[in-house]
């Protein structure tokens, strides 16, 4: 299933992750998928 609003898929962690965490960790792989 696609990730819910405000989250994005992380291939590194194999799960959806909160886009909010990109403030602290902007280089995370899933941040590319966050608006």
């Amino acid at each position: 299933a696609p990730c819910s609003r405000g989250s994005s898929w992380s291939a590194d962690l194999d799960k959806c992750m909160d886009c909010a965490s990109c403030r602290a960790r902007p280089h995370s792989d899933f941040c590319l998928g966050c608006a």
Partner: antibody, heavy 119, light 111 residues
Framework: QVELVESGGGLVQPGGSLRLSCAAS????????MSWVRQAPGKGLEWVAE??????????HYAESVKGRFTISRDDSKNSLYLQMNSLRAEDTAVYYC??????????WGQGTLVTVSS | DIQMTQSPSSLSASVGDRVTITCRAS??????????MHWYQQKPGKAPKLLIK???NLESGVPSRFSGSGSGTDFTLTISSLQPEDFATYYC?????????FGGGTKVEIK
């Protein structure tokens, strides 16, 4: 399933030292920030120290109340977190929790280990 | 440091009641998109458990009767219909900057 297991707590005299350990399993330890949070008897939660990732050069941060006395470290090869506590004071008496989180909210918590500083 | 003020410090309620706990930060912990405020539940003798992150995101496995709202400096945790297993102490925490700080806690007791 995720598990964090703390050990190393006990009774120590004021001025003494103690080393806490936390064994992690069930998640990608090397990708997660880790902290120690403590709770004095009958009191609320207090963040103590944080360690970030190898890619952050294992950056550490401390509460003012423990700065210069406590040292947080990690061994990603052993999925383990540590807290070296020196110059212990009565006010350091608390249950110490190991916590893990990708960032921000503390998703994973251990069961805690009790540290008692008393003569 | 950012101070977190939780209220009330304790409350008595009955099963089925709607319960509201508030947390006020001494400065804003929000961007235009996200709020860096989180809520935990702790039962006696147990470790805290994450309930809600980023002000309103329910953690997986947490019952939908729990909800969070707010932005800026003022935040709320609501339990829509209190259940026997919800009697516990609740804490807010910000992650805006270091040091991370927690609210003083709200103990929810049986009336």
């Amino acid at each position: 399933q995720v598990e964090l297991v703390e050990s190393g707590g006990g009774l120590v005299q004021p001025g003494g030292s103690l080393r806490l350990s936390c064994a992690a399993s069930g998640f990608t330890f090397s990708s997660y920030w880790m902290s120690w949070v403590r709770q004095a008897p009958g009191k609320g939660l207090e963040w103590v120290a944080e360690i970030r990732l190898k890619s952050d050069n294992y950056a550490t941060h401390y509460a003012e109340s423990v700065k210069g006395r406590f040292t947080i470290s990690r061994d990603d090869s052993k999925n383990s977190l540590y807290l070296q506590m020196n110059s212990l004071r009565a006010e350091d008496t608390a249950v110490y929790y190991c916590t893990g989180y990708y960032a921000d909210a503390m998703d994973y918590w251990g069961q805690g280990t009790l540290v008692t500083v008393s003569s | 440091d950012i101070q977190m003020t939780q209220s009330p410090s304790s409350l008595s309620a009955s099963v089925g009641d709607r319960v509201t706990i508030t947390c006020r930060a001494s400065q804003s912990v929000s961007t235009s998109s996200y709020s860096y405020m989180h809520w935990y539940q702790q039962k006696p003798g147990k470790a805290p458990k994450l309930l809600i992150k980023y002000a309103s995101n329910l953690e997986s496995g947490v019952p939908s009767r729990f909800s969070g709202s707010g932005s800026g400096t003022d935040f709320t945790l609501t339990i829509s219909s209190l259940q026997p297993e919800d009697f516990a102490t609740y804490y807010c925490q910000h992650s805006w900057e270091i040091p991370y700080t927690f609210g003083g806690g709200t103990k929810v007791e049986i009336k």
